[in-house]
Interface confidence: medium
């Protein structure tokens, strides 16, 4: 399964911070960065860095300390940018992350200094089974971006 999350401030549940996505092992979390046609919004485009953090970092929406891992940067608002995280128990890649069944992982985005964006937060709950099917379940929507 591929779970698509449109990561932008038009997504009310990401804004509130109580969004939950459930993923199984071998699923993919696809993060779609904000994308603008033309000049973009008058307040400027949203750009940010996405981090995996611990619970205190999630609660405070702060990506600081040894348990904050920068995952991706959404810095090209006029391009089509998407990142993928494979939910796997073991990863062969040095930049990959290893996920444990039954655990919850926390993602936040921190707006860049020039950005109009707000703090966005997502909880990823990893389930127990390995899955092999390939269908899409998006979370959020392209919104106004």
């Amino acid at each position: 399964l591929r779970h698509v999350v449109y990561w932008n401030s038009s997504n009310p549940r990401l804004l509130r911070g109580d969004a939950v996505v459930e993923l199984g092992l071998n699923d993919y979390l696809d993060i779609v960065c904000p994308h603008y046609e033309g000049p973009g919004p008058p307040e400027g485009p949203e750009t940010f860095a996405l981090y995996m953090v611990d619970w205190p970092g999630y609660e405070s929406c702060q990506a600081e300390g040894p348990r904050a891992y920068k995952r991706w940067v959404c810095s090209l608002p006029f391009g089509h940018v998407q990142f993928s995280e494979k939910i796997q128990r073991f990863t062969p890649f040095s930049l990959g992350f290893e996920f444990l069944p039954g655990e919850t992982y926390y993602y936040i985005s921190v707006p860049t200094p020039e950005s109009s964006g707000q703090c966005l937060r997502l909880q990823v709950s990893v389930c127990c089974k390995e899955r092999k099917s390939e269908s899409a379940h998006p979370v959020g929507s392209p919104g106004e971006s």
């Epitope: 996505v21 459930e22 993923l23 709950s125 998006p138 979370v139 959020g140």
Partner: antibody, heavy 112, light 107 residues
Amino acid sequence: EVQLVESGGGLVQPGGSLRLSCAASGFTVTTYGVDWVRQAPGKGLEWLGVIWGGGSTNYNSALKSRFTISRDNSKNTLYLQMNSLRAEDTAVYYCASDWAYWGQGTLVTVSS
Amino acid sequence: DIQMTQSPSSLSASVGDRVTITCRASQNVGTNVAWFQQKPGKAPKSLIHSASYRYSGVPSRFSGSGSGTDFTLTISSLQPEDFATYYCQQYKRYPYTFGGGTKLEIK
């Protein structure tokens, strides 16, 4: 345009059951978390539960497992199954998608 | 469950007034508080999330503040369309709970 339309309300006797529907358009029900909220006449808001995009649910434990949230992806519709209804369950029931979009509500009256 | 105590329960004010509604949580909820506006016979409308952030399209006269246990919703200059009932909600812990509401009436 996102729209939620509740239906299925009406008069039911104490101890009876009712299933409310929340038909969604403008988005797919596997996309958002959808919450159910109720409001007794002249009273405040009470959260009943949520069904997440992945299909899992969380409930208000005060309901004592009498209410169940489900959905039919093919119909893009959510459901609130209510059992062992009591007079105090009389309320307008709303579904809300990510707290941004709400249905118009459907009135449930529990009375003999 | 976390109790949300809202005050006052009703309030009379005039167009142009500055109005403050308060909400107190029975335990620390961080900034996981939202505010809603509801008009008679209508569904609630989201105003504020994360204690102090306005949703898109909400007028700037609405502002929220607070963290921990004490929260406020302020309307800086009341407009005729603002007369309604306002609810706070915590979403730190299940079950999500609402305050009892504040009915804002025309003086």
